[in-house]
């Protein structure tokens, strides 16, 4: 997680800090949402289990021209050990339904808050 350095401080960011900053960014997105987020773009829903960060990035990276989630995309890349590019989707994640980005962000936020409370920072 050393690549997370640079979001808030010059050195490596502790996992707990990185997760807290991601949560704060998602809170910021949901609270500042006036018009439909990303113009109602649809993304693949994911299983909020193992490999969740990469799966979330794989899903959100397909959204183009949405400045509101660009920081989230960058932050998620710090949690994912491999490079993710648009159109990529791990065989670990089933493509069963698409949801609006706004709902995706809300679902992800709820889950990350739960992980933070339980002390699961990686």
């Amino acid at each position: 997680l050393t690549c997370l350095g640079g979001f808030a401080s010059p050195g490596p960011v502790p996992p707990s800090t990185a997760l807290r900053e991601l949560i704060e960014e998602l809170v910021n997105i949901t609270q500042n949402q006036k018009a439909p987020l990303c113009n109602g773009s649809m993304v693949w829903s994911i299983n909020l289990t193992a490999g969740m960060y990469c799966a979330a990035l794989e899903s959100l990276i397909n959204v183009s021209g949405c400045s509101a989630i660009e920081k989230t995309q960058r932050m998620l890349s710090g949690f994912c050990p491999h490079k993710v590019s648009a159109g990529q989707f791990s065989s670990l994640h089933v493509r069963d339904t698409k949801i609006e980005v706004a709902q995706f962000v809300k679902d992800l936020l709820l889950h990350l808050k739960k992980l933070f409370r339980e002390g699961q920072f990686n």
């Epitope: 113009n39 649809m42 397909n62 021209g65 949405c66 648009a86």
Partner: nanobody, 116 residues
Framework: EVQLLESGGGLVQPGGSLRLSCAAS????????MDWVRQAPGKGLEWVST????????YYADSVKGRFTISRDNSKNTLYLQMNSLRAEDTAVYYC?????????WGQGTLVTVSS
């Protein structure tokens, strides 16, 4: 500029069929996955189906699985949705969408009304 123009909607009886088309321009159609999304009166957006760039992967919402078929003709820059065994709950405005873009790039949609 991305442009999408849906057509083929109309009034149909329950159990009937329709074929929707979406003519795309302004981008490399064959390079992108495409979606069908719908909005029922007074409801939110609902994803219907997605097809991969070359058409090898097709995905459907549970509510339409086995009844709807998505396809594409990259030589004509056109996306299709064959809708069979239509139900009243399929009544909605149907939009096609380039994956990863929101309604800023959608067309006007095509209205499908299922009623006896």
């Amino acid at each position: 500029e991305v442009q999408l123009l849906e057509s083929g909607g109309g009034l149909v009886q329950p159990g009937g069929s329709l074929r929707l088309s979406c003519a795309a321009s302004g981008f490399t159609f064959a390079g992108y996955s495409m979606d069908w999304v719908r909005q029922a009166p007074g409801k939110g957006l609902e994803w219907v189906s997605t097809i991969s760039p070359r058409g090898g992967g097709t995905y459907y919402a549970d509510s339409v699985k086995g009844r709807f078929t998505i396809s594409r003709d990259n030589s004509k820059n056109t996306l299709y949705l064959q809708m069979n065994s239509l139900r009243a709950e399929d009544t909605a405005v149907y939009y096609c969408a380039k994956e990863g873009t929101g309604f800023a790039y959608w067309g006007q949609g095509t209205l499908v009304t299922v009623s006896s």
